[in-house]
């Protein structure tokens, strides 16, 4: 019962986490204009992974997609890649974990297969969460660096009187959504891995019973038979886990380009 609860909760937490990662990736507010001490601004700039937007005090908002792919900073491309890998791994993990749920019966699927799938999905969720956290953290680091650079030359004087105010950017809502979502996916993954241990049937620890028949002493170990049929944690099963994780890591997904003006 505790295993089912742990697995179910892990699934739900991961589901929320992956939904959050998707939301964060799509959000436009990865970086928002720093308002200093002024909460009301006539022109408010904010940027996402896919487009940058400007909201005017008139209520008019204009967003422009990043039409170029090669002209974008490498860091931004890296963040995009990390978030997409996180989403892809998370989505596959969710798909795998649905079939792995103890409460769902699919044909004559053995508990060991469910345990394998639970572990596979758990690892996928962990990697997915780490990808999201890494992506958001890389972007945040980029923002901090740029913030202090633009603070250093906040006002660049032009001919004494004329000034050019540089726009500084600070953390947007998407970063916090991404961090929380990545954390939830990670926690969900750990819970799935914990549940896997409970799902895999342990070898029954019966004492050997000896039957003495005409001088021959033969010991029957029920656990031994069980292990040989692939129900326990043998090397063949281990290979499945490793192979499964490796296959998912190699999945590459490229974003379809949605540019809005």
């Amino acid at each position: 019962m505790a295993v089912t609860a742990c697995q179910g909760l892990g699934f739900v937490v991961s589901l929320i986490g992956i939904a959050g990662i998707i939301a964060a990736t799509c959000m436009d507010q990865w970086s928002t204009q720093d308002l200093y001490n002024n909460p009301v601004t006539a022109v408010f700039n904010y940027q996402g992974l896919w487009r940058s937007c400007v909201r005017e005090s008139s209520g008019f908002t204009e967003c422009r997609g990043y039409f170029t792919l090669l002209g974008l900073p490498a860091m931004l491309q890296a963040v995009r890649a990390l978030m997409i890998v996180g989403i892809v791994l998370g989505a596959i993990g969710l798909l795998v974990s649905i079939f792995a749920l103890k409460c769902i019966r699919i044909g004559s699927m053995e508990d060991s297969a469910k345990a394998n799938m639970t572990l596979t999905s758990g690892i996928m969720f962990i990697v997915s969460g780490l990808c999201a956290i890494a992506g958001v953290s890389v972007f945040a680091n980029m923002l901090v660096t740029n913030f202090w650079m633009s603070t250093a030359n906040m006002y660049t004087g032009m001919g004494g009187m004329v000034q050019t105010v540089q726009t500084r950017y600070t953390f947007g809502a998407a970063l916090f959504v991404g961090w929380v979502a990545g954390g939830l996916t990670l926690i969900g993954g750990v819970m799935m891995c914990i549940a896997c241990r409970g799902l895999a049937p342990e070898e029954t620890n019966y004492k050997a019973v000896s039957y003495h028949a005409s001088g021959h002493s033969v010991a029957y170990k029920p656990g031994g038979f069980k292990a040989s049929t692939g129900f326990g944690s043998n090397t063949k099963n281990k290979k499945i886990y490793d192979g499964g994780a490796r296959t998912e890591d190699e999945v590459q997904s490229y974003p379809s380009k949605h540019d809005y003006v």
Partner: antibody, heavy 115, light 113 residues
Framework: EVQLVESGGGLVQPGGSLRLSCAVS?????MNWVRQAPGKGLEWVAW????????TYADDFKGRFTISRDDSKNTLYLQMNSLRAEDTAVYYC???????????WGQGTLVTVSS | DIQMTQSPSSLSASVGDRVTITCKSS????????????LTWYQQKPGKAPKLLIY???TLESGVPSRFSGSGSGTDYTLTISSLQPEDFATYYC?????????FGQGTKVEIK
């Protein structure tokens, strides 16, 4: 079609108060008050977000003037306190548009501060 | 606050003339986010409310004749009337629409020669 109609102007003594109204019909996200002293140029007074009620003022009017709105009546207000002779002007309400331009203006209401 | 300086303060011109009014801001009105300059031009006739002509420094408001055009970026802006018409004799104002408080230029009065 947006229509703006100001009212509430008139003669007031120095140190007195006056509340200007601007009846708004049509979509407005944010509104402004702009004034023009006789024979002088335009002077921006205040701005308000019609949805949140968030205001901002020109430095000369902070503390003396209050911009507000009444959602139910779809009306914009400018409460003017501690009026001075130099506050004598035609007061316009105007709607903010694309590029923060003011595309629709009221006909203006004259405020005269004199003893 | 951003100061707006218009020149000339007044000018005399004839119908059909090409008229240029300049406006200078104390700070750049160019927004890095969308590469647009937040400068607005208005026309005001005596006893009337101002009329929006141009926003984003060069975008013509709907219904405004094409003889009006705006240009400029950063701190220097220009309003041009390619061929002055009788109805164009009025006072023209530029406005900082980039940051609060919004500020207007002192105005340029276009009179008949």
């Amino acid at each position: 079609e947006v229509q703006l109609v100001e009212s509430g102007g008139g003669l007031v003594q120095p140190g007195g108060s006056l509340r200007l109204s601007c009846a708004v019909s049509g979509y407005t996200f944010s509104m402004n008050w702009v004034r023009q002293a006789p024979g002088k140029g335009l002077e921006w007074v205040a701005w308000i977000n019609m949805y949140t009620g968030e205001p901002t003022y020109a430095d000369d009017f902070k503390g003396r003037f209050t911009i507000s709105r009444d959602d139910s009546k779809n009306t914009l207000y400018l409460q003017m306190n501690s009026l001075r002779a130099e506050d004598t002007a035609v007061y316009y309400c105007a709607r903010s548009s694309k590029g923060n331009g003011l595309d629709y203006w009221g006909q203006g209401t004259l405020v005269t501060v004199s003893s | 606050d951003i100061q707006m300086t218009q020149s000339p303060s007044s000018l005399s011109a004839s119908v059909g003339d090409r008229v240029t009014i300049t406006c200078k801001s104390s700070q750049s009105l160019l927004n890095s986010g969308n590469q647009k300059s937040y400068l607005t031009w208005y026309q005001q006739k005596p006893g009337k409310a101002p009329k929006l002509l141009i926003y984003w420094a060069s975008t013509l408001e709907s219904g405004v004749p094409s003889r009006f055009s705006g240009s400029g970026s950063g701190t220097d802006y220009t309003l041009t009337i390619s061929s002055l018409q009788p109805e164009d004799f009025a006072t023209y104002y530029c406005q900082n629409a980039y940051s609060f408080p919004f500020t207007f230029g002192q105005g340029t009065k276009v009179e008949i020669k």
